[in-house]
Interface confidence: low
Amino acid sequence: EGICRNRVTNNVKDVTKLVANLPKDYMITLKYVPGMDVLPSHCWISEMVVQLSDSLTDLLDKFSNISEGLSNYSIIDKLVNIVDDLVECVKENSSKDLKKSFKSPEPRLFTPEEFFRIFNRSIDAFKDFAVASETSDCVVSSTLSPEKDSRVSVTKPFMLPPVA
Amino acid sequence: EGICRNRVTNNVKDVTKLVANLPKDYMITLKYVPGMDVLPSHCWISEMVVQLSDSLTDLLDKFSNISEGLSNYSIIDKLVNIVDDLVECVKENSSKDLKKSFKSPEPRLFTPEEFFRIFNRSIDAFKDFAVASETSDCVVSSTLSPEKDSRVSVTKPFMLPPVA
């Protein structure tokens, strides 16, 4: 079973609603871990959840807490709690083959669609995560720049695959 | 009774929810009619509703239409319909003392809170509108620059007064 898998709840519907409810041209800052789309998840997941937690916490500050229904605030608040749980879980499992990327995360601006595609990819990593082989290398080819990471911004419309 | 008053519906609750559901630092472009906060409403209302219609239509394009509940899209769509009705009504009443501002509207950036305060002020104008006195002047004092208009961003927290 994937490490920390029990911390991941099914929030696909909420995230889809959140993306639809954010301006398409609004930019969200995220310190993106280079190579997350070409390297195995154990190479980047521990850093990525920390960065997602920071970005979602900042995003939460941009909204007012209104009581009724599924507001952006309430959805983001829920996502912050999920990611913060994963941050804790990663700390607990830090010896279990979760490696540090050799490259520092770089602050970049993402549209909501791009940001939550990265969020979803990170959540998926916990679902699929199995203890990695020690031989699995965490080096990005020097010819691949972070901007060329293939899944950051794809041409397909935003559809989230199932999370759990 | 105010001109076009029957076109105005009570959307206070929706607008309050919309403002809470937009990022506080998101900027909305509006061609702001200089002097709208220091001149009588008949001086600026005909232009202001046209500009609000354009801005809200642009804003609508930034969101996806999701069927469930009160989404940002559904609220903005409702506001566009209200304002478009008012644009039509203003055209019908264009001879009824609704004057053209001598200054062209200027494109400016507003936070959601600022933008919807202007929106609300414009909606209120229809509620209160009585046929204006011909002697009522539509000239902004040359000592007052548009930037000094006092009600664009007031010190009270965002609370919309009743509209209709």
Epitope: - | D25, Y32, T111, E147, V154
Partner: antibody, heavy 115, light 105 residues
Framework: LVESGGGLVQPGGSLRLSCAAS????????MSWVRQAPGKGLEWVSA????????YYADSVKGRFTISRDNSKNTLYLQMNSLRAEDTAVYYC???????????WGQGTLVTVSS | QMTQSPSSLSASVGDRVTITCRAS??????LGWYQQKPGKAPKLLIY???SLQSGVPSRFSGSGSGTDFTLTISSLQPEDFATYYC?????????FGQGTKVEIK
């Protein structure tokens, strides 16, 4: 815009900067603090909406600095706690116009953090 | 991030001077250009990428959108020797370029 409150303070100390505004409707404008370390470029520090309801901070000062305003006194404030040597700079207050640019600046006040 | 180039330049009175600013991400038109003289506060020259601020001489002009922006001084005057900064202020956090110092040749 006239800043005041700068001076020499020890690392870990606190300081409160003020910016007195006149000549415009203060409550209609978002305001910012921008700083400039000696011989260096400009760095945005913090911003506050016209009503004071929304505040924003640069990562370098988040949790240590607090921006506030008193619209009845036409005054902007920056409360600086846990000061570090790298906070040494001239601090400017600036008005954000409706085009989201800084169109009016104060003359600046020097903050020196040193033991 | 905003990257300005060059970091400094030497020019003569009457020269045409061009300074460029590149944003790491598209910032629409939310770009301003500021002039700063030693010991003084910055002064807004150009707002919304290409609009001339009131009271600024027409020899200053701005252009560009998205990620690439340019400040041009058509005919450099003695009072124009200063440091120039670009700033992206449409999104938080507001970011300034590192500055371009225009010196007398």
């Amino acid at each position: 815009l006239v800043e005041s409150g700068g001076g020499l303070v020890q690392p870990g100390g606190s300081l409160r900067l003020s910016c007195a505004a006149s000549g415009f409707t203060f409550s209609s404008y978002a305001m910012s603090w921008v700083r400039q370390a000696p011989g260096k470029g400009l760095e945005w520090v913090s911003a506050i909406s016209g009503s004071g309801g929304s505040t924003y901070y640069a990562d370098s000062v988040k949790g240590r600095f607090t921006i506030s305003r008193d619209n009845s006194k036409n005054t902007l404030y920056l409360q600086m706690n846990s000061l570090r040597a790298e906070d040494t700079a001239v601090y400017y207050c600036a008005r954000r116009d409706f085009f989201a640019h800084f169109d009016v600046w104060g003359q600046g006040t020097l903050v020196t953090v040193s033991s | 991030q905003m990257t300005q180039s060059p970091s400094s330049l030497s020019a003569s009175v009457g020269d045409r001077v061009t300074i460029t600013c590149r944003a790491s991400q598209g910032i629409r038109g939310y770009l301003g250009w500021y002039q700063q003289k030693p010991g003084k506060a910055p002064k807004l020259l150009i707002y919304s990428a290409s609009s001339l601020q009131s009271g600024v001489p027409s020899r200053f002009s701005g252009s560009g959108s998205g990620t690439d922006f340019t400040l041009t001084i058509s005919s450099l005057q003695p009072e124009d020797f200063a440091t120039y900064y670009c700033a992206g202020t449409g999104f938080m956090p507001y970011t300034f370029g590192q500055g371009t110092k225009v010196e007398i040749k």
